[in-house]
């Protein structure tokens, strides 16, 4: 019962990360402009992963899409893969963790493979909330990297009789929804890994006990139930997951520039 | 179509308060915003204050404390009061419909305030 | 506050010639959010209220003829008549649309000899 209950509550942890992520993911908020400078603005900036917005007092929205690829900042690029990535793993893991429910029943699946799938789902589900967390992370520390970058700017050449405000951008709501949600789908995603082990039956280690019938003798091996690791294959002690999982876009420089319009 | 129209009293004492009220028609106020302006008699437009679709409000820093904006969505009206008037702030009152660019495309003729004793 | 000024205060021209009026802000009205310029201009014939001509720094209102152009960008503007009719009498103001308090010009009058 208890194992029936994580295990749900680990698919619906999971399922409401996962729709954060996508959530934010599609938000416009990554980035919004900063007015501790300028608080009378009656213009205000907002960009995302897609495109940038402007929204304006009067009420007008307008937003422009970034319709290049490789003009591009390398870790905006970077941001965006890691956040797809995290969707396909995520929805992936769901699809698979749905089979692997134990209050649904597919044919004659046995709580052996039931547990390789909801293992492998986990497994999925935390790789899914850890991309998403570095994915906001690495756009949190480029923001924060131009925006005393920015400041920096701001404070020098200012002799002349004409100012001009940079327009500086800070923390949008997205950031903090990819965050909760990428902790939620990593939460459901332990989750799902620790219900994994209540769904496999014991193997009981007794030693092999010879039971001398009349006659002949026959030897009964217990534990011959040992859950599998693989979908199909009963091999033992094979390693499915290395959990060092390292991505290609750790090693990126910062643009100069984060005003990619 | 989009109309604007004050109504004010014409005439008042210095040292009273003031309220006019810009009646408008062909929108609605919880879309747009509106700006009072005023244009002392041979003088340039000066810009008073702005109230929001969302209801938010912005004065002229040198007129803040005596100007309140406020508005009545359901009546489609805005009202500006002014208190302690003195001579100068005779002028003819305009209130403006905004659109993009926070730009102000629809006027009304406005109502001219004559504060003298 | 940002200062609009403009100049010159006052111009006599005939029907026909090109006419240029500055306008300049004591800070930038550039976004760089959508690279528009947040400074419009309005006309105010004799006895009317004022009427909207160009937002945007250069964006024409419908309605508004094409000898009108507007352009500029950061805090320098300019207003440009390209032939002037008689029903171009009038004074022009330019405002900061940007940040608040929506500052405008003085305004320059617009005679035809």
């Known amino acids: 019962m208890a194992v029936t209950a994580c295990q749900g509550l680990g698919f619906v942890v999971s399922l409401i990360g996962i729709a954060g992520i996508i959530a934010a993911t599609c938000m416009d908020q990554w980035s919004t402009q900063d007015l501790y400078n300028n608080p009378v603005t009656a213009v205000f900036n907002y960009q995302g992963l897609w495109r940038s917005c402007v929204r304006e007092s009067s009420g007008f929205t307008e937003c422009r899409g970034y319709f290049t690829l490789l003009g591009l900042p390398a870790m905006l690029q970077a941001v965006r893969a890691l956040m797809i990535v995290g969707i396909v793993l995520g929805a992936i893991g769901l699809l698979v963790s749905i089979f692997a429910l134990k209050c649904i029943r597919i044919g004659s699946m046995e709580d052996s493979a039931k547990a390789n799938m909801t293992l492998t789902s986990g497994i999925m589900f935390i790789v899914s909330g850890l991309c998403a967390i570095a994915g906001v992370s690495v756009f949190a520390n480029m923001l924060v990297t131009n925006f005393w970058m920015s400041t920096a700017n701001m404070y020098t050449g200012m002799g002349g009789m004409v100012q001009t405000v940079q327009t500086r951008y800070t923390f949008g709501a997205a950031l903090f929804v990819g965050w909760v949600a990428g902790g939620l789908t990593l939460i459901g995603g332990v989750m799902m890994c620790i219900a994994c082990r209540g769904l496999a039956p014991e193997e009981t280690n007794y030693k092999a006990v010879s039971y001398h019938a009349s006659g002949h003798s026959v030897a009964y091996k217990p534990g011959g139930f040992k859950a599998s690791t693989g979908f199909g294959s009963n091999t033992k002690n094979k390693k499915i997951y290395d959990g060092g999982a390292r991505t290609e876009d750790e090693v990126q420089s910062y643009p100069s520039k984060h005003d990619y319009v | 179509q989009v109309q604007l129209k004050e109504s004010g009293p014409g005439l008042v004492a210095p040292s009273q308060s003031l309220s006019i009220t810009c009646t408008v028609s062909?929108?609605?106020?919880?879309?747009?915003?509106v700006s009072w302006i005023r244009q002392p008699p041979g003088k340039g437009l000066e810009w008073l204050g702005v109230i929001w679709g969302g209801g938010s409000t912005y004065y002229n820093s040198a007129l803040k404390s005596r100007l309140i904006i406020s508005k009545d969505n359901s009546k489609s009206q805005v009202f500006l009061k002014m208190n302690s008037l003195q001579t100068d702030d005779t002028a003819i009152y305009y209130c403006?419909?905004?659109?993009?660019?926070?730009?102000?495309?629809?006027w009304g003729q406005g109502t001219t305030l004559t504060v003298s004793s | 506050d940002i200062v609009m000024t403009q100049s010159p205060s006052s111009l006599t021209v005939t029907a026909g010639e090109k006419v240029t009026m500055s306008c300049k802000s004591s800070q930038s009205l550039f976004n760089s959010g959508n690279l528009k310029n947040y400074l419009t201009w309005y006309q105010q014939k004799p006895g009317q209220p004022p009427k909207l001509l160009i937002c945007?720094?250069?964006t024409r209102e419908s309605g508004v003829p094409d000898r009108f152009t507007g352009s500029g960008s950061g805090t320098e503007f300019t207003l440009t008549i390209s032939s002037v009719q008689a029903e171009d009498l009038a004074v022009y103001y330019c405002q900061n649309d940007y940040s608040y308090p929506f500052t405008f010009g003085s305004g320059t009058k617009l005679e035809i000899k």
């Open positions: 062909g929108f609605s106020l919880t879309d747009y915003g």
């Open positions: 403006a419909k905004h659109h993009y660019g926070n730009a102000c495309d629809y």
């Open positions: 945007w720094a250069s």
